[in-house]
């Protein structure tokens, strides 16, 4: 519905009786009268374009604000072309300025420029050129501005001329009201249009029967916009659970349909795996063996836990195991499947078993996995490990049974050492290595094998109990292939990668670290 206008000031309708203040008196703006169709037309005009430094003010009478919060100012005016005057009149302007001042009392003839705040510079869309002016074809411009929020009892408008040739024919000041309205199952009364501040222009609505404010929602309120039009509700009345909107009323859901909460949606048919509902139902109960998770919407079919993961494999790689599995064949009707991996280790000699979560390392946290693989490392050699992969979904917590699959694997080797070059010279290489701490107690010695690159006929071996060695008596500027292998009581562990390390050339001699 369009806004309703309430006029506070209408210069054109006042017939020259308003007696606005001009400053300086008589030398700038002045009231003029013209007769059109035997009716007097009044205007305020100024045209001191040939004189520089014009500062002419026209102030309205004091206007009582009443209930208005934002006012609209409609101006109708003419502006003459500066080229109508000799040499374009260097001091001539084609705009004027609009100001306002709020006050709780009428200052009468006490005019003070400093109390006024500029609203805008008013420029014409069309100027009146000489030929039009002399033919009495003046170009009438219409401009509108608004000001708000207003808080004092009343206000003045003022027009500042700085050297234009202007005639102000109409000044209309009004505010807007939003009309009475029934919308969104709420009734809104006629309301004064607000200012920019929404809290000053919001209006509470009254809900119709079986309509409510949704839980946690805001009261049904609409903004009465500055232009007197209602905007979209902030909050609204919605048909309560078990009811749907039919025209401007709320009607109970039919049997076999439901509506879970106060919302804009219509009643929905009961979903899969539910029992039929009575009239006005707010939900549909699940069939036996099917469930709803607390966060599931009532519109979702009832679901059940998944079956176990399908086809679990455990592949050993030194002191690591890669577990892979495929999703359950029955998802239970849900997509929120996650997997949990648990680990058990057993000593082959005693057969004693226990959890091993504290001693192993997973490639990602083993609970709430969404991918179907995980790598387990830091496994101890010569141990038997059993891994359990459980599939769960949003309703698994509602039943006591679990859906899982297990796989076992024996670890026979240590993890390969990680090798680093610590330093080098023309005739030596300093090498260090590391293996995971849980495996270190099982290592008897480390065996370092090295040979010249390209020489496959001979190689050298050094054994040490430590984690580093310096290889001496090497040829300068030569690349050597170096490998480190852990030796355990049971035999050889996994060997490291073969590394290529080069001694320094004679020119770059000296023991340089890398």
């Amino acid at each position: 519905a369009q806004g309703k206008e309430v006029v506070l000031l209408d210069f054109a309708a006042a017939g020259g009786e308003l007696g606005w203040l001009t400053h300086p008196y008589g030398k700038g703006w002045d009231l003029m009268q013209n007769i059109m169709n035997d009716m007097p037309i009044y205007m305020y005009s100024v045209c001191n374009v040939m004189s520089g430094d014009q500062d002419n003010w026209l102030r309205t009478n004091w206007v009582y604000r009443g209930e208005a919060e934002r006012i609209f100012i409609e101006l109708k005016f003419t502006v003459r072309d500066c080229n109508s005057f000799p040499g374009g009149a260097s001091s001539c302007k084609e705009t004027f300025n609009l100001y306002y001042a709020e006050s709780d009392l009428d200052y009468g003839t006490n005019f003070q420029k400093r109390l006024f705040t500029k609203i805008d510079t008013i420029a014409p869309d069309e100027i009146t050129v000489s030929s039009d002016f002399e033919a009495r074809h003046v170009k009438l411009n219409v401009e509108e501005r608004s000001v708000g929020p207003l808080t004092r009892k009343g206000f003045y408008l003022a027009f500042q001329d700085i050297g234009a040739c202007v005639a102000l024919l109409s000044v209309r000041v009004y505010y807007k009201k939003c009309p009475e309205l029934l919308q969104g199952l709420a009734h809104f009364p006629e309301t004064i249009a607000g200012s920019d501040a929404p809290s000053l222009a919001t209006v509470a609505g009254t809900c119709v029967d079986h309509a409510v404010v949704p839980p946690g929602g805001e009261e049904p309120r609409m903004h009465c916009a500055v232009d007197g039009e209602w905007l979209v509700p902030i909050g609204q009345c919605l048909c309560q659970a078990g009811y749907e909107k039919v025209e401007d009323a709320c009607q109970a859901c039919s049997p076999g349909f439901f509506k879970f909460e106060a919302s804009e949606s219509p009643c929905l048919e009961c979903p899969e795996h539910t029992l039929p509902s009575p009239e006005g139902a707010t939900s549909c109960e699940c069939e036996e063996g099917f469930f709803r998770a607390p966060q599931d919407p009532a519109s979702m079919p009832c679901t059940r836990p998944p079956s176990a993961p399908h086809y679990l494999t455990a592949v050993g790689m030194g002191a690591k195991v890669e577990l892979r599995w495929t999703p359950p064949q029955d998802s239970g009707g849900r997509e929120d499947i996650v997997y949990s991996v648990t680990c058990e280790q057993c000593w082959p000699e005693s057969g004693e078993c226990g959890p091993c979560e504290a001693s192993v390392r997973y490639s990602e946290p083993p609970h709430g996995l969404t991918r179907t693989s995980v790598t387990v490392s830091d496994l101890e050699p010569h141990m038997n490990y059993t891994f359990t992969v459980e599939a769960r979904n949003g309703v698994s917590g509602l039943v006591t049974s679990r859906s899982f699959r297990t796989a076992s694997v024996s670890i026979n080797q240590t993890e390969p050492p990680k090798v680093r070059l610590e330093g080098r010279s023309t005739t030596s290489l300093s090498v260090s290595w590391s293996i995971p701490p849980p495996q270190q107690s099982r290592v008897w010695k480390y065996e370092v094998t090295y040979r010249k690159k390209g020489d496959s006929n001979s190689y050298n071996v050094r054994r040490t109990e430590g984690f580093s060695v310096t290889l001496d008596d090497l040829a300068p500027d030569t690349t050597y292939l170096v490998q480190v292998q852990a030796l355990t009581q049971e035999g050889q562990g996994a060997g490291s990668k073969v590394h290529e390390f080069q001694t320094l050339s004679p020119e770059g001699s000296g023991n340089l670290a890398v």
Partner: antibody, heavy 120, light 108 residues
Framework: QVQLVQSGGGLVQPGGSLRLSCAAS????????MHWVRQAPGKGLEWVSV????????YYADSVKGRFTISRDNSKNTLYLQMNSLRAEDTAVYYC?????????????WGQGTLVTVSS | SELTQPPSVSVAPGQTVTITCQGD??????ASWYQQKPGTAPKLLIY???NRPSGVPDRFSGSSSGTSASLTITGAQAEDEADYYC????????????FGGGTKLTVL
Amino acid sequence: QVQLVQSGGGLVQPGGSLRLSCAASGFTFSSYAMHWVRQAPGKGLEWVSVISPAGNNTYYADSVKGRFTISRDNSKNTLYLQMNSLRAEDTAVYYCARASVGATGPFDIWGQGTLVTVSS
Amino acid sequence: SELTQPPSVSVAPGQTVTITCQGDSLRSYYASWYQQKPGTAPKLLIYGENNRPSGVPDRFSGSSSGTSASLTITGAQAEDEADYYCNSRDSSGTHLTVFGGGTKLTVL
């Protein structure tokens, strides 16, 4: 009947003073700007002074500035022109006139005129 | 800022006569025209674009162009013999309002 009736003219010596009055009737005196216009014998019209409706604004022609004072008493519907330091060139018929709109006219109602003669 | 009028103009009865008024202020503001007969106060004839107060015969009309304003009497009569003055707001800011020097119209 809308009219302006003037009084107070006469013969005065150079350097002397005189006060002219202009009594208004038939309209809302306090709503209009009022002017004094003079006409030297055998000459044209010369604007002298203006006063705003409430009496808070006044303007004077350069020839009388500092010597003449325009005033009004809206409770008595009367306009005044106090003339001091009169000179021979101030000799003229003085008219009061109403500005029909605004400050500067046009002058739609005129008094009958009163002669001021400055002579020794 | 001054307004300039011809000192005198004459017309035969029933003929049309035009009295002119020149001045820079007339680019900015309309002229008003006054008629003054001997021994009486001036009387408003024309103001604004071409407005006549009630009681003024329609043979009197006004017009303006650039720095010039004109009073035209179409079908002059003996009783129109009088002095005619133009008047305008002063756009220079020197004065508030200015009068022309007056034109004596003689109806032959």
